[in-house]
């Protein structure tokens, strides 16, 4: 009931945009800037001075960044007692990009809304917003979480249910951006297992694999461009790298999607009525990985059953030699442990500076692909010559 | 495979991709609450962080959260 | 503080009609979607109808489409419910609700409509 | 429309007894859901939201849980304010509707 007492502004400084514009350029990322949308004139339009500020500074520097307005702004009302409603957030949209193409930012790139998940009057809010403003983003940003940390329980994670809700929720994005504005690239702007931090002794846990392998294979399949995880590193228990800078199971498993998982999204299915607890993925391979080459397939599935599996490759790949990149939980707290094995080897860091090999398993052609119970696995399905991927 | 073994056969459809998602399809965030951590120069200076940071490259670094909305820049703070 | 006070109920015959209002206070009333909510003597409860922040959008349950009416006025922080051809199964106990996506946090105390005749 | 199941129907425990009561959605609804407590004469008050977040000012003795289509509302002690009927309502679409109500009586 009105808890928009619960936050209050703080400021940041030049040295801080230093540190974080200077920490994504040294590690090969490109740098998104969430500016603060609850500045407002007495007449609820957005205003741009603080922004302004900000871009001149970013400007003198010669960043390169992209930007967002605003986050989760259906929520305004329960975090602030404001409401905006999408027409006017479209209006201050518009605002941003002039500025931005008043500056030495004339091609930066402009992201948004970030709603949370298309509830009914949050798919409302994106609608009016993407016919407001819909024009002047590059992308379409949207959050989504599984879960609420505070309650959420192992069987959760390991619940084919849940990880099913998310469809429904990419669908109605999608019903909302083809009726505003069709075409219009869709990404997660924000998203992780449970909300509220994550959940205490499972969001950085083995188990909370599945939620994420099923969410980009989900993501990939449905038509969403870019996924970005909730958090790379910070407080909470969803992070990827925790605050001893050690990597967690969920940073090994984006480790290996990155180096192992291409751009072109084709399409894996279980042949039956089971398939909820086995979920299969298929791409063309990351060509940028040395050990392929154009024309294979990378396949990525996850078993939810509690025996093992043996998935049976179809015509004309059956007889192709395959290399098996399984993930299984190390040590006595099993799907809750914070190690992870590949191929039975345990992932660390070798020292600050290098990140171990990940070392496939040829298997030998011919042979099923064997996934033990609660586990997932990347099979990369070599010489596969696969004509959309080349 | 033996004939007591749990076998699923898959079906692929590879004629022509589904989708072509970003080749930075898989990013990650910094929750801009960091930003207001003590720390927050130190931690993001940190050799290790970068190096696994750089693992992931290409790909986005989104700084939000619900701290973006109360976050005001000070070019004077020091 | 938020009050939400409904007003307007009482005994009416079968085919005959009502308006409720509900006064509200505390809160921004323009930010907030509004809902009515009614409960029949005894039984559960049963949404009727919500409407947008700015009136444009209204939504009501099947039984009383055509008959009922949701409308507001912001400037006088005022939720209405006009109800025509009023029958005997709607007579309740009803409610006026502050509505979130998530939960309706605030309800009067409600207002009864007997029909009768 | 979504029509909402509560179990069981009514209920009597005893203070410091803990009570589970769920409510089953003909369909997925995410986690749309919201508990309310209704004491006689009274209007309904909002305890859980979003099937799992407790109101601000609501006893933490109370939770919920759940997601898609089976929810559960958990008085962990029940104390003696807490008899009372308890209903689960849904807002992922609508028509919104609520289950028909669980009545917590004293044994």
């Known amino acids: 009931a009105d808890p928009g007492k619960k936050f209050k502004n703080s400021t940041y400084s030049r040295s801080s945009v230093d540190v974080l514009y200077t920490f994504a350029n040294c590690s090969g990322l490109d740098l998104i800037f969430g500016l603060n949308a609850l500045l407002r004139t007495a007449d609820l339009q957005w205003n741009s001075s603080n922004a302004q500020l900000l871009l001149d500074y970013c400007s003198s520097k010669g960043y390169n960044i992209s930007w967002e307005l605003g986050n989760e702004p259906n929520s305004f009302l329960k975090k602030a007692d404001i409401f905006i409603n999408g027409s006017q957030l479209g209006e201050d949209f518009i605002q941003l990009h002039k500025l931005l193409r008043k500056s030495t930012f004339k091609n930066a790139k402009l992201y948004g809304p970030d709603v949370g998940q298309p509830r009914r009057k949050t798919a409302k809010m994106l609608k009016s917003f993407l016919k407001a403003g819909g024009e002047v983003i590059d992308s379409v940003t949207w959050h989504h979480y599984y879960l609420n940390g505070r309650t959420a329980t192992k069987e959760d994670f390991l619940n084919p249910d849940v990880l099913d809700i998310f469809i429904s929720s990419v669908q109605k994005v999608f019903q909302v951006v083809e009726s505003t504005r069709p075409g219009k690239k869709v990404w997660l702007g924000e998203t992780s297992s449970a909300y509220g931090g994550g959940a205490p002794l499972l969001s950085d846990t083995f188990a909370a694999g599945f939620m994420w392998l099923d969410k980009l294979g989900l993501s990939a399949r449905m038509g969403i461009e870019v996924v970005m995880r909730q958090v790379f590193f910070g407080a909470g228990n969803y992070h990827l790298v925790d605050e001893n800078f050690d990597p967690l199971p969920d940073y090994w498993l984006s480790l290996l999607f990155k180096k192992l998982v291409g751009t072109k999204v084709l399409m894996a299915s279980v042949q039956g009525s089971k398939r909820r607890k086995l979920r299969v993925y298929l791409h063309c391979t990351n060509t940028d990985n040395p050990r392929y080459k154009e024309g294979d397939l990378t396949l990525y599935a996850i078993n939810l059953h509690n025996v093992t599996k043996y998935l049976r490759l179809p015509y004309p790949f059956s007889n192709k030699q395959v290399d098996k990149y399984l993930l299984r939980p190390l040590g006595p707290h099993g799907l809750l442990s914070k190690s992870v094995q590949l191929n039975g080897l345990t992932l660390k860091m070798v020292d600050d500076q290098t990140l171990p090999p990940l070392m496939e398993k040829p298997l030998r052609p011919g042979s099923s692909l064997g996934l033990p119970a609660f586990s997932y696995s990347f099979f990369v399905i070599r010489n596969a010559k696969v004509a959309a991927c080349i | 495979a033996d004939p007591g073994q749990d076998v699923v056969d898959l079906d692929f459809f590879t004629q022509e991709p589904l989708h072509l998602v970003s080749p930075s399809f898989l990013s990650v965030t910094i929750d801009a609450n960091l930003a207001t951590d003590p720390r927050f120069l130190i931690l993001l200076g940190s050799p290790k962080l970068r190096t696994l940071a750089r693992g992931l490259s290409p790909a986005y670094l989104r700084f939000g959260g619900t701290k973006t909305d109360f976050l005001i820049f000070d070019p004077k703070k020091e | 503080e938020v009050q939400l006070v409904e007003s307007g109920g009482g005994l009416v015959q079968p085919g005959g009609s009502l308006r409720l209002s509900c006064a509200a206070s505390g809160f921004t009333f323009s930010s907030y979607w509004m809902s009515w909510v009614r409960q029949a003597p005894g039984k559960g409860l049963e949404w009727v109808a919500s409407i947008y922040q700015d009136g444009s959008e209204k939504y009501y349950v099947d039984s009383v489409k055509g008959r009922f009416t949701i409308s507001r006025d912001n400037a006088k922080n005022s939720l209405y419910l006009q109800m025509n051809s009023l029958r005997a199964e709607d007579t309740a106990v009803y409610y006026c609700?502050?509505?979130?996506?998530?939960?309706?946090?605030?309800w009067g105390q409600g207002t009864l409509v007997t029909v009768s005749s | 429309a979504i029509q909402l199941t509560q179990s069981p129907s009514s209920l009597s425990a005893s203070v410091g007894d803990r009570v589970t009561i769920t409510c089953r959605a003909s369909q997925g609804i995410s986690s749309a859901l919201a508990w309310y407590q209704q004491k006689p004469g009274k209007a309904p008050k909002l305890l859980i939201y979003?099937?799992?977040s407790l109101e601000s000012g609501v006893p933490s003795r109370f939770s919920g849980s759940g997601s898609g289509t089976d929810f559960t509302l958990t008085i962990s002690s029940l104390q003696p304010e807490d008899f009372a009927t308890y209903y689960c309502q849904q807002f992922n679409s609508y028509p919104i509707t609520f289950g028909q109500g669980t009545r917590l009586e004293i044994k």
């Open positions: 979003d099937a799992s």
């Open positions: 609700a502050r509505e979130l996506d998530w939960g309706w946090d605030y």
